[in-house]
């Protein structure tokens, strides 16, 4: 008997210092690339290895980015998207929607699944 | 300290083929989108080829089929395979990537890049 697949959202803050090779992670997504069907939003692709975002250790690969430095990232196109990321300064503050996979098993089991939806 | 070095230009005559190198520092390859770039004189840069970390290609419609874009991650080194050369392929040959865009076709559109080569000339003639 298969369980019920639900996903549990949390939202989080994540400070990051731009490193030489910037924050370290790819972006997808934007109002003309849809990285999720009928959601415009911005998508972290990849985490780079020894990057700012991996040494912080909290961004992960799958995770939506809302804001950059309390800037909305609603109907963005995808390359004004990366231009806030590029111009986003030393310091950088990110506004962040984890989606964790959770599996209800028939007697209540949860697991935690891939958070890239 | 991040650097991309062009390689494998020259002069072959229309038809014959090529093999263009960027050797990467600094940073792992296959973490970025990573793109082929060349600019003729007088005109505009354009984006030849790209790759998007996960591997995904864009090629322009004038080098589709003639061009193969290929990374070896072991030797953190882009290809651009380029066969049936013509002369208007004529032009000086960049690689460049984005340090957020995973999207190879946004990349290759793109005037905003963050790293680049000096570049490699390829010219196309009799």
């Known amino acids: 008997m298969n369980g019920r697949v639900d996903y549990l959202v949390t939202e989080e803050e994540i400070n990051l210092t731009r490193g030489p090779s910037g924050l370290g992670f790819n972006i997808v997504g934007g109002t003309d690339q849809q990285y999720v069907s009928n959601d415009s939003g911005i998508y972290v692709s990849r985490i780079k290895e020894n990057g700012a975002a991996a040494l912080d250790g909290r961004l992960q690969e799958g995770d939506k980015i809302l804001s950059v430095n309390g800037q909305d990232l609603k109907n963005l196109l995808h390359q004004d998207a990366v231009d806030l990321f590029r111009n986003a300064g030393y310091a950088v503050s990110l506004r962040v929607q984890h989606r964790l996979q959770v599996q209800n098993g028939p007697i209540g089991h949860r697991g935690e699944g891939d958070p890239s939806g | 300290d991040v650097q991309l070095v062009e390689s494998g230009g020259g002069l072959v005559q229309p038809g014959g083929s090529l093999r263009l190198s960027c050797a990467a520092s600094?940073?792992?390859?296959?973490?970025?989108?990573i793109g082929w770039f060349r600019q003729a004189p007088g005109k505009e840069r354009e984006g030849v080829s790209c790759?998007?970390?996960?591997?995904?290609?864009y090629y322009a419609d004038s080098v589709k089929g003639r061009f193969t874009i290929s990374r070896d991650n072991v030797k953190n080194t882009l290809y651009l395979q380029m066969n049936s050369l013509k002369p208007e392929d004529t032009a000086l040959y960049y690689c460049?990537?984005?340090?957020?865009?995973?999207?190879?076709?946004?990349?290759?559109?793109?005037?905003?890049?963050?790293?680049w080569g000096q570049g490699t000339q390829v010219t196309v003639s009799e």
């Open positions: 790759i998007s970390s996960h591997g995904s290609t």
């Open positions: 460049a990537a984005s340090y957020y865009s995973d999207y190879e076709v946004a990349v290759c559109r793109s005037d905003a890049l963050d790293a």
């Open positions: 600094g940073f792992t390859l296959d973490d970025y989108a």
